[in-house]
């Protein structure tokens, strides 16, 4: 028997520095977690102790903190090289700055293979990107070889900016011929490494003949065997075992997100490359693991540019940006409108001639808006200003919901109106009218939504049975502020871009902003 140790990360999202337990900015260092310096310590410890070790990343290193905003992926290549990753799969967020924003900082600079079997380049891009990412890579591990085959969510064109010259194929259809090819190359130990979410990971384990292990990402799935060491609740045991259609037991793993854990999976193969046994658990990278001093010094060196960036002007406002709780928790506020407009703008994807855009709606809990911005400071808006407005380090995500769920959400928005509570919704692409004289749960008297399948966008009444795409904070997607109906009833959830980054990009693009209060949210009494 031959033993392989797979160390894996996914959805690190720019958490190069250690973070607090909830993966936001580290405040009390003695209780902070993750970060590449701490990760390196643990990886090196395992590499020294065990003979056959692979360090893999399942995508979405890009996007999530000011590190990505400033360094645009150069930080990913630099620190992943320093940690000596063996392979990485492309995630949807790797395309956030377009194909060029992937090629130049990451693909050309990475010293490790970057993989995806289901992304096919066409047109002029095909020759430009040729060889910079691969469908698979055969890695030597001691005297054995291990094949790593990559995959990426086929939803990427709706979630990011891959452009028109990349085709995202069905994962299973694309993976099978590559795995077959590996078999003909005498490679009998094959890992599928990819970024399509836990459900697709399980399907790949079930359907792709010849895949021995699946290492996934995208859904931030936490798996654990035994008592979990922190706040994350396991979605299943680690590894999660899937019985393939040809009767094999295939371990599937994921390691939550944000570099908080290092996935640790030990696989025992027989001499024919069959998995005999698999066991392990994610390792919580808490403060009991010291940060590696040389990596930490490098982080501190790179940090300097970030501090300079946060005080630079992004754009100007010529109006007061009202982000006060007195406004945003009670009525339409122009800060809410600005943020929602930025959220929609960030999700403009013309992927179908029938649709002007794939999504038109935004909702945002008023309690998530934490500060106004005064225009009487020469109108200047900085990253620092935005960090005061959106201090929680969240993301603006894409969900699919039925109209009936949206109606419940808007009823929840005003079910205890008047107590300055955070669940009051700010909106974009939605016109809502409330009648507060009615009983809670029956206060939404009009709810019109902006069409997407139209050449001239206009507002139509919400249909209860229709499925709508909505952009909202991850906080709401996870049921925060009492929006349990969103968490329970959502049909799809894809994590999006860092909240501050979305708004800062929009302001930089617009240069001068003047959001108004324009009647998106209205109150009435009496009949309609």
């Amino acid at each position: 028997a031959w033993e392989l140790t797979i160390l894996h990360t996914n959805d690190v999202h720019s958490r190069l520095e250690q973070t607090s337990e909830d993966s936001s900015k580290c405040v009390n260092a003695s209780r902070c977690m993750g970060g590449v310096a701490r990760l390196f310590t643990k990886v090196q410890q395992i590499r020294r102790a065990e003979p056959n070790v692979l360090l893999l990343d399942a995508g979405d290193q890009y996007q999530g903190t000011i590190w990505f905003t400033v360094y645009k992926g150069a930080e990913v290549a630099h620190f992943m090289n320093a940690l000596r990753y063996d392979a990485m799969a492309l995630g949807n967020h790797e395309f956030d700055n377009g194909v060029e924003g992937l090629i130049e900082p990451l693909l050309k600079e990475a010293k490790f293979p970057i993989l995806s079997a289901n992304i096919k380049a066409k047109g002029p891009l095909a020759s430009q990107i040729s060889g910079l990412y691969l469908p698979y890579k055969v890695l030597p591990v001691g005297d054995e070889v291990v094949g790593i085959v990559g995959y990426t969510s086929k939803e990427t064109p709706f979630l990011s900016n891959p452009g028109t010259n990349l085709v995202f194929e069905d994962e299973i259809t694309a993976l099978q011929p590559e795995v077959d090819k590996l078999k003909t190359l005498n490679v009998n130990k094959i890992i599928a490494l990819g970024h399509s979410g836990f459900e697709m990971d399980k399907l790949i384990a079930q359907k792709v003949r010849g895949v021995d292990v699946v290492v996934g990402g995208h859904s931030n799935t936490f798996l654990y065997t035994g008592n979990p060491p922190s706040k994350e609740v396991p979605a299943g045991k680690y590894p999660f075992i899937v019985t393939s259609d040809d009767g094999r037991k295939v371990p599937v793993v994921q390691a939550y997100a944000f570099g908080k854990y290092l996935g640790y999976l030990k696989i025992e193969f027989d001499e024919r490359g069959n998995v005999i046994s698999s066991h392990g658990n994610p390792i919580l990278l808490n403060s009991s693991i010291p940060e590696d001093p040389s990596i930490k010094a490098d982080i501190n060196k790179w940090r300097i540019k970030l501090d300079n960036y946060s005080t630079q002007e992004l754009g100007k406002t010529i109006v007061y940006l009202d982000g006060s709780s007195q406004s945003c928790r009670f009525r339409e506020c122009n800060m809410g409108n600005l943020i929602c407009d930025a959220m929609i703008n960030n999700n403009l994807r013309h992927t179908d001639e029938m649709f002007w855009n794939h999504v038109s709606m935004c909702i945002l809990n008023g309690g998530g808006i934490r500060s106004p911005i005064d225009e009487r400071n020469n109108g200047t808006i900085t990253w620092e200003n935005l960090a005061a407005v959106l201090p929680f380090g969240g993301t603006f995500d894409l969900v699919q919901l039925k109209g009936s769920t949206l109606k419940k959400a808007f009823e929840h928005s005003v079910h205890r109106y008047g107590q300055s509570t955070g669940e009051f919704l700010q909106v974009g692409g939605i016109h809502v009218v409330y009648d507060l004289s009615r009983k809670p749960g029956d206060r939404v008297v009009k709810l019109d939504v902006l069409c997407t399948k139209c050449r001239v966008p206009s507002y139509d009444p919400l249909k209860m049975d229709e499925v709508y795409k909505v952009i909202l904070p991850n906080f709401l997607a996870n049921g925060g502020d009492g929006f349990q109906m969103i968490k329970d009833e959502l049909l799809r959830h894809d994590s999006g871009d860092q909240d501050i980054n979305v708004v800062s990009t929009y302001i930089s693009k617009m240069k001068v902003i003047y959001p108004a209060v324009e009647g998106r949210i209205k109150f009435s009494t009496g009949s309609h």
Epitope: R84, K111, P140, G142, E144, K183, L185, N186, E271
Partner: antibody, heavy 115, light 108 residues
Framework: QVQLLQSGAEVKKPGASVKVSCEAS????????ITWVRQAPGQGLEWMGW????????NYAQKFQDRVTMTTDTSTSTAYMEVRNLKSDDTAVYYC????????WGQGTLVTVSS | EIVLTQSPSSLSASVGDRVTISCQAS??????LNWYQQKPGKAPKLLIY???NLQTGVPSRFSGSGSGTDFTFTISSLQPEDIATYYC??????????FGQGTKVDIK
């Protein structure tokens, strides 16, 4: 333990062919490819090609593409390499090695091409 | 095809000396590099795999480092039995491989 046993030395005339064998033992033959490397007298090591023992798939170095054929016989766990149209500068020791890690080598087969 | 350039092509050193051999790749090969020792009339012996990992049973005076395009092989304290030719070999693109031209090491 892993062993690769190669056939004995050969003397050939220019234009002739030679077939070198490499018999594997101590492991499952079909689990690892076989690599062939040669070394001319006083010269360095030269990678010639690789064959999959799984299905006979071959990858040859450009230089040997049209003169070399690699084959396997899984029933006897043996790999073969044939070099055709021999020239005097094909005089070399020919080695087989297991897989891609090259931790296990045959003892070498000296092929002398002389008129 | 990736070309490996080894230097020096030969060297003489005294017993106990530190010996360093360099290997430069024409394109980046991550850490996919092996080092071999070959004594006259013998098959090559794998010393270092993946640029820096010592093969089982190989004395710890042998070490390797590097990544990307520049690699180094070191014998920390040369012993009489280390007289041999040393080769680097890259395996960036399975199952292809290429060797450096070799460095002959002898004792002064």
């Amino acid at each position: 333990q892993v062993q690769l046993l190669q056939s004995g030395a050969e003397v050939k005339k220019p234009g002739a062919s030679v077939k070198v064998s490499c018999e594997a033992s101590g492991y499952t033959f079909t689990n690892y490819g076989i690599t062939w490397v040669r070394q001319a007298p006083g010269q360095g090591l030269e990678w010639m090609g690789w064959i999959s023992t799984y299905n006979g798939n071959t990858n040859y170095a450009q230089k040997f593409q049209d003169r070399v054929t690699m084959t396997t016989d899984t029933s006897t766990s043996t790999a073969y390499m044939e070099v055709r149209n021999l020239k005097s500068d094909d005089t070399a020791v020919y080695y087989c090695a297991r897989g891609w890690g090259f931790a296990h080598w045959g003892q070498g087969t000296l092929v002398t091409v002389s008129s | 095809e990736i070309v490996l350039t080894q230097s020096p092509s030969s060297l003489s050193a005294s017993v106990g000396d530190r010996v360093t051999i360099s290997c430069q790749a024409s394109d980046k090969i991550n850490n996919y590099l092996n080092w071999y020792q070959q004594k006259p009339g013998k098959a090559p012996k794998l010393l270092i795999y993946d640029a820096s990992n010592l093969q089982t049973g190989v004395p710890s005076r042998f070490s390797g480092s590097g990544s990307g395009t520049d690699f180094t092989f070191t014998i920390s304290s040369l012993q009489p039995e280390d007289i041999a030719t040393y080769y680097c070999q890259q395996y960036n693109s399975y199952p292809y491989a290429t060797f450096g031209q070799g460095t002959k090491v002898d004792i002064k």
